[in-house]
Amino acid sequence: GITNINCSGHIWVEPATIFKMGMNISIYCQAAIKNCQPRKLHFYKNGIKERFQITRINKTTARLWYKNFLEPHASMYCTAECPKHFQETLICGKDISSGYPPDIPDEVTCVIYEYSGNMTCTWNAGKLTYIDTKYVVHVKSLETEEEQQYLTSSYINISTDSLQGGKKYLVWVQAANALGMEESKQLQIHLDDIVIPSAAVISRAETINATVPKTIIYWDSQTTIEKVSCEMRYKATTNQTWNVKEFDTNFTYVQQSEFYLEPNIKYVFQVRCQETGKRYWQPWSSPFFHKTPETVPQVTSKAFQHDTWNSGLTVASISTGHLTSDNRGD
């Protein structure tokens, strides 16, 4: 970058090279060029010569003043006009940055995705800082009082093998950058309470011709968790409002869920599950589309329409559900 150039003098920023966005700042340039009493000192920002708010301090130094500086990054350099030199002489350069101190991290969440072998912790970092901001995730065993720290710039995956201090932990997040430091509230977790079952996937759909045609959705999960609660939401693709069916599920078999739908309409289905009574849900599965037939023939939609696996298990019990309505968006 600009900071690697050979300098004939120096350039500095007040209050600092990294400063709060919207501040008034001063950039100083001091020439130290052999056999040159600078006639003028010029400033450049991102290669564009600055015209206004330049004040000469003394024979070798000038100041460039910016009001309400809002650019996240800029490369500054300055030059001198030396008598008897045809071209400007480079003095020095500096990269400057503006941004914000971090907000207090909130909504700290830690989950263990089944089979992942990791505890994944995320948080709401708050407003964009624009500058390099690091996060330290503190994990403290409530049983052994041992604390581990993990440095990251976003979320963190912590191997469950490294969580040797029992089942109960306190987790909190510290955010820090050049402009400040903030710490989240502590989250208390129990490892058994934060497991999210293996992803539920819709594999196929079929509409069966009967007095009242019905659509059967086939779906499954590889979870080994016994007590699982699931939701399936569906709507016509032209609608805004989702309908939601709730299920208490045993994934010994591929699930079959029945729906009585309007003919000749394209529907979208999604499913998600959680360990019964626990806090965290899976994200909604990827959308599965099925168009109901106009009238008689049997129509089947298969999972090849998107990247999902088909379990190959035999179809067994039909799960029954309770129809509810929900305005949740995607």
């Epitope: 009493q37 564009i48 010569k49 015209r51």
Partner: antibody, heavy 119, light 107 residues
Framework: QVQLVESGGGVVQPGRSLRLSCAAS????????MSWVRQAPGKGLDLVAD??????????YYADSVKDRFTISRDNSKNTLYLQMNSLRAEDTAVYYC??????????WGQGTLVTVSS | DIQMTQSPSSLSASVGDRVTITCRAS??????LAWYQQKPGKAPKLLIY???SLQDGVPSRFSGSGSGTDYTLTISSLQPEDFATYYC?????????FGQGTKVEIK
Amino acid sequence: QVQLVESGGGVVQPGRSLRLSCAASGFDFDSYGMSWVRQAPGKGLDLVADINSKSYNYATYYADSVKDRFTISRDNSKNTLYLQMNSLRAEDTAVYYCAVHHSDYFEYWGQGTLVTVSS
Amino acid sequence: DIQMTQSPSSLSASVGDRVTITCRASQDIYTNLAWYQQKPGKAPKLLIYHASSLQDGVPSRFSGSGSGTDYTLTISSLQPEDFATYYCLQDSEYPPTFGQGTKVEIK
């Protein structure tokens, strides 16, 4: 050689508008700053408006007395400088010179165009 | 903005005289000073830039000197064509600013 030819001056009523032009030749137009300097009858020289060179990203400057009324612009494809003067006042009466600067002193000047604001 | 004060505002001199006009800046302008000559009904003409550099085509009887805040234009031997008004201009800090002018008249 460098030539600057102003046009567009004349007599205009207070509150009306006028547009001055300056046709330039004999130099690399967009590498130079261009200015309008005026001289009221029997008075000294005053910088009215300035539009800088390409290296300054064509930054503009206006004297306080003309801010929000005058607009300086340049058409580098036509080597022409303009001054759009709106809401003219009696005190805007002057000879308006187009001037060229590569450093910040004015190296070359046009012959001037007289603007008279009178009812 | 930097203020430029020229003196005298006018002077009377004879052909052959040595004439000196001074210009004082409100702060150090580091030799960023130019001198112009203007004849009635004509555009200003650049005589000197960088306080002491003579513009091409300008007679050598014109010279400039000075540093800091004080600058001088000297005409070593006044010629009939030199009767005109002279202006200084600082271009050390933007915007450039003119002195109020010195009128050189025939005595």
